[in-house]
């Protein structure tokens, strides 16, 4: 007779990153008999949901339930009916949630009330919607990464099974850009962190890790944009704005309410004269480099040593994963390779920023000219940001490793959020049987 | 400044109940979504439920639905959660937060179901 084969004692869970431009579902499985072991849980599905980011509804929140239902129906059917009920959902909302909380604790509980309602209505556990904090979205990147790489695994091996990996037990850091915020997270050398708010101290499967963490608010691509903007139209003559970030020949108009209707231009508002201007691409590299270090205060530090706006930041140490749009720019770029030096990835950005607005538009055809336009300015911001920001030279760039995805799991802080939250990271070494959870991050 | 107080919490005997409650202030109560978290030793904390700024609207997660009951008085500015049915597993501390808030801001109150 022919063997049956045993149902897959398996689980599921499901996050939901709830991002300032868009919003991505995940859905995770592991086997429910490992759920202590490292590197046991991976990811089946992303689903990108059509549309902008949650933070974009505060306007027409009934909309909220329509705009969820393609991948929340699509997590209904990757997952096996009987497994529904005792999966988890979680959603995390970040930077563009953490702005609109700041410009209305009101509109953005408004926000989280309709997404709650929207996902209860499905047969999932619902475990919450809330907006996380950027040091959480820092340390569940640099978990997620670090998980992903088999980093906390106590098993050494002469071979390698993931890319990157070093045959040590030293972290990878974790280098996050979003549309709103940054992070940078790492373990440093031996340096003690001199802010208290920028430490992190984790005890994971039986080894203690006291992790730097950084979470820039406005700092991140599309937020950044907003700043340089509001910052060059202090000094425009009129109402035309010729921006070296952009390419020669492009042109577009942009509302004065639209640039100061976010809290990341604050600083530079002011009364002008016109209610809208015209941005008149010029494409010069250097030129836009110079303009984006003007969003970096370097003048002011109360630390042994700083990234930019008197946050302090340890020397930077070992090998970082960049992820999340570090990758998705520099994969658009053809820049991810390790070959590629800093000095090559500065050459490639001048020569494609100089490239006449036409001719971009032909050769990616493909693409939404409202992205297309904007690789310019978002490939010379991860330079700045990166050489400028975070002290990252000519010789370390080697160390940073532009990553998408690790074992076909997406880098970012989803995993690690939902391994924290289903207390699948034990703080001690499991037996080889697990036996009980002890405590977790 | 913002003050969320949580008490009410003790000892209770599986299958017993408890009422804990949350006093708020430093911000207008009857404006924003309310939530209950609880955190067990060992264990990550975890969300419980969530009620909406008028009442009208609650929501719990799987394993506490049809034995906990969130509700809210705006006119005395609490917030409420009726826990019947106790289990061991529900023991834990419980917190309560404003719903836009990223982490809870009170010192919780001890819920221990034991025989």
């Known amino acids: 007779t022919q063997n049956k084969a045993l149902p897959e004692n398996v689980k599921y869970g499901i996050v939901l990153d709830a991002g300032s431009s868009h919003t991505s579902l995940y859905i995770y499985k592991w086997p429910a008999e490992k759920e202590n072991d490292t590197g046991v849980v991976h990811q089946v599905e992303e689903c990108r949901v059509k549309g902008p980011g949650i933070s974009k509804f505060v306007q027409k929140v009934n909309e909220i339930g329509i705009y969820l239902t393609d991948c929340m129906e699509r997590a209904r059917e990757v997952i096996p009916r009987s497994q529904h009920q005792e999966t988890p959902v979680y959603l995390g909302a970040t930077a563009g949630m953490r702005l609109l909380r700041m410009e209305s604790e009101e509109l953005a509980d408004r926000v989280l009330d309709v997404v709650e309602r929207s996902l209860s209505n499905y047969p999932f556990d619902f475990q919450g919607a809330r907006i996380i904090t950027g040091q959480e979205e820092g340390a569940y990147g640099w978990i997620t990464i670090n998980y992903l790489l088999g980093k906390f695994s106590q098993k050494t091996r002469w071979f390698s099974i993931v890319p990157y990996e070093t045959n040590n037990q030293e972290t990878f850091g974790a280098l996050d850009l979003g549309g709103a915020s940054t992070q940078v997270t790492f373990v440093p050398q031996n340096q003690t962190i001199e802010s208290p708010d920028n430490a992190l101290q984790f005890r994971l499967y039986g080894k203690d890790y006291n992790v730097y963490t950084h979470s820039f608010l406005c700092y991140g691509k599309d937020q950044a944009l907003w700043q340089k903007l509001a910052k060059d139209i202090q000094v425009a003559s009129n109402e035309i704005l010729r921006d070296p970030c952009f390419h020669p020949g492009y042109k577009k108009v942009v509302n004065v309410s639209d640039l100061y209707k976010t809290p990341c231009t604050k600083r530079f508002e002011m009364t002008l004269p016109f209610q809208q201007f015209e941005i008149q691409g010029i494409g010069n590299y250097q030129q836009c480099h110079q303009s984006i270090l003007e969003l970096f205060n370097t003048s002011y530090c109360p630390y042994s040593q700083c990234a930019f706006n008197g946050i302090f930041l340890p020397p930077l140490q070992g090998d970082f994963g960049a992820f999340s749009a570090f990758y998705f720019v520099m994969k658009f770029l053809n820049l991810t390779s390790e070959k590629v030096s800093q000095e090559k990835v500065t050459e490639m950005m001048k020569k494609f920023c100089a490239q006449p607005w036409e001719e971009i538009k032909t050769s990616y055809a493909g693409v939404k000219e409202k992205y297309l336009s904007e690789y310019c300015f978002s490939g010379t911001y991860i330079l700045s940001l990166l050489l400028q920001g975070y002290h990252f030279t000519a010789d370390s760039w080697e160390h940073i490793h532009f990553i998408g995805k690790i074992q076909g799991s997406d880098a970012g802080w989803t995993l690690g959020y939902m391994l924290n939250l289903t207390n699948m990271i034990p703080a001690e070494q499991p037996l080889s049987t697990p036996l009980s959870h002890s405590t977790y991050v | 400044e913002v003050q969320l107080v949580e008490s009410g919490g003790g000892l209770v005997q599986p299958g017993g109940s408890l009422r804990l409650s949350c006093a708020a202030s430093g911000f207008t109560f009857s404006n924003l979504g309310m939530s209950w978290y609880r955190q067990a030793p060992g264990k990550a904390r975890e969300w419980v439920g969530s009620?909406?700024?008028?009442?009208?609207?609650?929501t719990y997660q799987n394993s506490v639905k049809g034995r906990f009951t969130i509700s809210r008085d705006n006119s005395k500015n609490t917030l409420y959660l009726q826990m019947n049915s106790l289990r061991a597993e529900d023991t834990a501390v419980y917190y309560c937060t404003r719903r836009v808030d990223s982490y809870p801001r009170g010192q919780g109150t001890l819920v221990t179901v034991s025989s």
């Open positions: 009620i909406s700024a008028s009442g009208d609207y609650t």
